[in-house]
Amino acid sequence: QAGPLPKPTLWAEPGSVISWGNSVTIWCQGTLEAREYRLDKEESPAPWDRQNPLEPKNKARFSIPSMTEDYAGRYRCYYRSPVGWSQPSDPLELVMTGAYSKPTLSALPSPLVTSGKSVTLLCQSRSPMDTFLLIKERAAHPLLHLRSEHGAQQHQAEFPMSPVTSVHGGTYRCFSSHGFSHYLLSHPSDPLELIVSGSLEGPRPSPTRSVSTAAGPEDQPLMPTGSVPHSGLRRHWE
């Protein structure tokens, strides 16, 4: 009795965060025995797409010529071989930016901060939103979500950082979103350059934990230390 077929690999090019209107290609790579590939979107009422494999049959291409809200979501793929369907791939989360107008990102009291002091990054949206996301350029993942309680919508979210070290320096952007789909994000805010000066250095955290000086598992986004976020919002990280 042969074991289950190995699961395929699923990825997106040029990446999994795509601006509205841009093209994206989803690839599913299985085995040379694959006869057909299938892409399923989470909670959709039917198979999303099916494709014949490209030679030499070990992968298939699913093209999205123009990214829209329809395509944002969580995907898995499968392949069919002569003995049946494979296990599902690990999920791919396809996020669309540009669903809402861009928020404004600012630093309080100033984007120029002395090491060891505190700074708060403030993300403000024109219309009330219930999720705010802070990212740092070249970070491995989004740094932090702030999501409102009970669907209460806010115009802003605060991301406090304390104490600041040199590793907090860099370029930040924020996004806003509505809770009904965290796969739909606003346009990015204009970039904010956070400049850390002075020599009051504590222990250097791992670069992948760029918002926090707290210890934690490698490659995990951690909560910033310090004050409570803007009223009505709770910290939430993926």
Epitope: E43, S44, P45, A46, P47, W48, R50, E69, G73, F180
Partner: antibody
Framework: QVQLVESGGGVVQPGRSLRLSCAAS????????IHWVRQAPGKGLEWVAV????????YYADSVKGRFTISRDNSKNTLYLQMNSLRAEDTAVYYC???????????????WGQGTLVTVSS | DAVVTQESALTTSPGETVTVTCRSS?????????ANWVQEKPDHLFTGLIG???NRAPGVPARFSGSLIGDKAALTITGAQTEDEAIYFC?????????FGGGTKLTVLG
Amino acid sequence: QVQLVESGGGVVQPGRSLRLSCAASGFTFSNYGIHWVRQAPGKGLEWVAVIWFDGNNKYYADSVKGRFTISRDNSKNTLYLQMNSLRAEDTAVYYCARDVITLVRGVPFDYWGQGTLVTVSS
Amino acid sequence: DAVVTQESALTTSPGETVTVTCRSSTGAVTTSNYANWVQEKPDHLFTGLIGGINNRAPGVPARFSGSLIGDKAALTITGAQTEDEAIYFCALWYSNHWVFGGGTKLTVLG
């Protein structure tokens, strides 16, 4: 041309069982999901259940969950609905309707059968 | 359970544009509801018109289009014809089940 033909309806007492069939032709049955949809006399449509092309995904309306079972035999191009513990409120014309091959390339509920009447009465 | 609401009846004239809407009791209709439109002609003849990812079924005239307008799904007939007189049902998907609206009886005054 695409054809869906339902059969198996009739008069049945409350609490009893009935099995409906839907014979498909004119398309590659094994590529498509299929729905059961019902319409009570003088009422609108009520979705009952769907089964995906390979039979591995099945979804049901809350009103029939645990009582009805959807299944298919791709070698016979036939869809089934096993209805147990029937109630008076299950009285309706039952239709099978074709689903999509894939959402990016089709329209759910595109072709329908002519329906089969199920009457649940003592 | 979700309830899907449509206008019970609409009347239009040939050549006019008419819009049938579909509202969800759970909030705004979104792309995740995969709004679907089905036409019922006399003698219980049903045909799927629009659904999936904004697809129009083969053979369905281009005057039929689907969209999201505000918090509702909409079926627009641009330049209605007398043969468009029918009952139109919308169906919305809720993660693991479909729910049909009550149907809209469209009368096209000839």
